[in-house]
């Protein structure tokens, strides 16, 4: 995994100017309505802001050094670090008693890489040390991937902080909801 | 009976703005996010977008970008979709359709449907 | 996106037949895979989720397999009211996607 080797702390990011994607136009306030406006949301209070109203799961450029040890590369390389939100939260409040809790209202998505390129990078080497050559995997495309609830948090580390949704006060959705119980209200359904 | 119905067919000039509406009724609305796709005449299905009705938090299909604004109102149970500078290719019919679960294979589906909105756009 | 396609796009059979149909995603997408049967006129309506768990209601003569890119929904004996158009419909990746249709036709 030559990408994952050469991501360290070591790598200094540069970001490009002008690279980032432009906010969307600001929709006209709807007080009366409930309407999907931009903005984040507070990460413990999924409900007290309007969710993202694209899915912004964005490609950000960005512009780094590769190193491997003292060795650095003889110029930097441009790469997409995949970032932002697919789409509204899906999560959906469920009171019972005194307790609110959170149940899924839709898939789990998560802004991740997609496709990767591969580069080759001359590595600069001081006191003398002849050049070396590296093949770096770089992220070339992002996507809205879907999440299950079987995945645990190992292999969520490697799609960023973005990924690591805390679960905090989940529980897994009641079984009326399953298809069989959803079909008893489909009259005519066939 | 669950069920999902729509506004009548609407006929709009290009470059206008059409806005469809999908009532539901028996179950409680705010449990499901809906979803619109749209069919063109003779063509396949295309998903547009959804909207949590507790957030009003919507997402879209970012080929609708800028053009697509879903909205819900909780007090009539119904979800709305606006569509924008319109053109002829949006000639379509438009669908509400809530996303259903299975929690034992952790599954999602469009399990009920309006019955359809026709827009033409012609000039 | 996901391209999802169907083959084939449409097909011929009498009443009592075999039908296969199936579908190819361009990416992986698990057993993400859903299939709706449309009439003329009509919202689709779900027959199979979750590439091969049948929908409550729907007839025991509907089934699906595949995993990963390739599926196939199969009718093991045609039924008159099974003449219509059927898409597939993958839910691992945004934007949803589905099939560009497979239309059965009375012969």
């Known amino acids: 995994q030559g990408w994952q080797a050469f991501k360290n702390d070591a790598t200094e990011i540069i970001p490009e100017l002008g690279e980032y994607p432009e906010p969307p136009p600001e929709l006209e306030n709807n007080k009366t309505m409930n309407r999907a406006e931009n903005g984040g949301r507070p990460p413990h209070h999924p409900f007290e802001t309007k969710d993202v109203s694209e899915y912004s799961c964005r490609e950000l450029h960005f512009t780094r050094y590769v190193t491997d040890g003292p060795c650095r590369s003889a110029k930097p390389v441009t790469e997409l670090v995949c970032s932002g939100q697919c789409g509204p939260a899906r999560l959906l409040p469920n009171a019972i008693g005194r307790g609110k809790w959170w149940r899924p209202s839709g898939p789990d998505f998560r802004c991740i890489p997609d496709r990767y390129r591969a580069q080759r990078v001359q590595l600069l080497c001081p006191g003398g040390e002849a050049p070396r050559a590296r093949k770096v995997r770089l992220v070339a495309s992002c996507k809205c991937k879907r999440l299950t609830r079987f995945h645990n948090q190992s292999e969520l580390k490697d799609f960023g902080t973005e990924a690591a949704r805390p679960q905090k006060g989940r529980k897994p959705r009641p079984r009326a909801r399953s298809a069989k119980a959803n079909q008893a209200e489909l009259e005519n359904a066939y | 009976e669950v069920q999902l119905v729509q506004s009548g067919a609407e006929v709009k000039k290009p470059g206008a703005s059409v806005k469809v509406s999908c009532k539901a009724s028996?179950?409680?609305?705010?449990?499901?996010?809906m979803h619109w796709v749209r069919q063109a005449p003779g063509q396949g299905l295309e998903w547009m977008g959804e909207?949590?009705?507790?957030?009003?938090?919507?997402g879209y299909n970012q080929k609708f970008k800028g053009r697509v604004t879903m909205t819900t109102d909780t007090s009539t149970s119904t979800a709305y979709m606006e569509l924008r500078s319109l053109r002829s290719d949006d000639t379509a019919v438009y669908y509400c359709?809530?996303?259903?679960?299975?929690?034992?294979?952790?599954?999602?589906?469009?399990?009920?449907w309006g019955q359809g909105t026709t827009v033409t756009v012609s000039s | 996106d996901i391209q999802m396609t169907q083959s084939p796009s449409s097909l011929s059979a009498s009443v009592g037949d075999r039908v296969t149909i199936t579908c190819r995603a361009s990416q992986d997408i698990s057993n993400y895979l859903n299939w709706y049967q449309q009439k003329p006129g009509k919202a689709p309506k779900l027959l199979i989720y979750h590439t091969s768990r049948l929908l409550s209601g729907v007839p025991s003569r509907f089934s699906g397999s595949g995993s990963g890119t390739d599926f196939t929904l199969t009718i093991s004996s045609l039924q008159p009211e099974d003449f219509a158009t059927y898409y597939c419909q993958q839910g691992d990746t945004l934007p949803y996607t589905f099939g560009g249709g497979t239309k059965v036709e009375i012969k």
């Open positions: 909207i949590n009705p507790n957030s009003g938090g919507a």
């Open positions: 028996g179950y409680t609305f705010t449990d499901y996010n």
């Open positions: 359709a809530r996303l259903g679960y299975d929690d034992i294979y952790d599954d999602w589906y469009f399990d009920v």
